[in-house]
């Protein structure tokens, strides 16, 4: 679970150790602030739960790619 260290900065201190199915993911955001100990991805699931993930892991990168492509593909 991400932690807000102040109103402007949210950090991840631990990463999920479970791969999340891409069908459960709605969006993501990158955590790059130097105020945080780790660079991270926060996935938001379709039930609005936020999960911290390690951007160095391939499944995380693949999920980001999938979501990026999804947002640029016009829905028919």
């Amino acid at each position: 679970q991400p932690d807000a260290i102040n109103a402007a900065v949210t950090c991840c201190y631990n990463f999920t150790n479970r791969k999340i199915s891409v069908q459960r993911l709605a969006s993501y955001r990158r955590i790059t602030s130097s105020k945080c100990p780790k660079e991270a991805v926060i996935f938001k699931t379709i039930v609005a739960k936020e999960i911290c993930a390690d951007p160095k892991q391939k499944w995380v990168q693949d999920s980001m790619d999938h979501l990026d492509k999804q947002t640029q593909t016009p829905k028919t």
Epitope: R30, T32, S34, P37, K38, E39, P55, K56, D65, D68, K69, T71, Q72
Partner: antibody, heavy 117, light 107 residues
Framework: QVQLVQSGAEVKKPGSSVKVSCKAS????????MHWVRQAPGQGLEWMGR????????KFDPKFQGRVTITADTSTSTAYMELSSLRSEDTAVYYC??????????WGQGTTVTVSS | DIQMTQSPSSLSASVGDRVTITCKAF??????RAWYQQKPGKAPKLLIH???SLEHGVPSRFSGSGSGTDYTLTISSLQPEDFATYYC?????????FGGGTKVEIK
């Protein structure tokens, strides 16, 4: 705050090698990737490659593959870039930079490498 | 490699002008692009990454837009400290590539 401090300018002969260091403070380098980008005089920016200091996995632009070695020492929070078989076209400012996502939030001050006979 | 073509290569503008720099990727990069500002003798500085994420401390007069292969950096009202060279960069796939740069000069 995050700081990346690079080693000083170098003058090298063609055919030789150069090793540039980049010491990080204000961050744990194993939590990021360390990249190297170069800029020839009056030219644009060129990504060379990166290392994951966690496991020493590297990725390079194929253009530099075989000629560049990127290493990292997590105990000293230092990344290194060694370029071999130097030629005059390698004269450039070499920058280290950090970032997991493929863009670069923090940069070193740059190290000028001059290759001249 | 994904080639990034930036235009114009240079432009002259006055303080207060609206300035637009464009970058075209040779394939879809799905908003995975960044913009940097570089002043002579200095390292580049990250301005914007991804769809619209303005780096902390970057003035709101800088904005990024675009999708697919076409992206734009806009400076809504040019300030004296904005005269510099600007680079776009794609981070959709390695090797990460930069545009050729746009030098913004004083008219």
């Amino acid at each position: 705050q995050v700081q990346l401090v690079q080693s000083g300018a170098e003058v090298k002969k063609p055919g030789s090698s150069v090793k540039v260091s980049c010491k990080a403070s204000g961050l744990t380098i194993s939590h990021t990737y360390m990249h190297w980008v170069r800029q020839a005089p009056g030219q644009g920016l060129e990504w060379m490659g990166r290392i994951d200091p966690d496991n020493h996995n590297t990725k390079f632009d194929p253009k530099f593959q075989g000629r560049v070695t990127i290493t990292a020492d997590t105990s000293t929070s230092t990344a290194y870039m060694e370029l071999s078989s130097l030629r005059s076209e390698d004269t450039a400012v070499y920058y280290c930079a950090r970032g997991v996502f493929g863009f670069f939030e923090h940069w070193g001050q740059g190290t000028t490498v001059t290759v001249s006979s | 490699d994904i080639q990034m073509t930036q235009s114009p290569s240079s432009l002259s503008a006055s303080v207060g002008d609206r300035v637009t720099i464009t970058c075209k990727a040779f394939e879809d990069i799905y908003n995975r692009r960044a913009w940097y500002q570089q002043k002579p003798g200095k390292a580049p500085k990250l301005l914007i990454h991804g769809a619209t994420s303005l780096e902390h401390g970057v003035p709101s007069r800088f904005s990024g837009s675009g999708s697919g292969t076409d992206y734009t950096l806009t400076i809504s009202s040019l300030q004296p400290e904005d005269f510099a060279t600007y680079y776009c960069q794609q981070f959709w796939s390695a090797p990460y590539t930069f545009g050729g740069g746009t030098k913004v000069e004083i008219k």
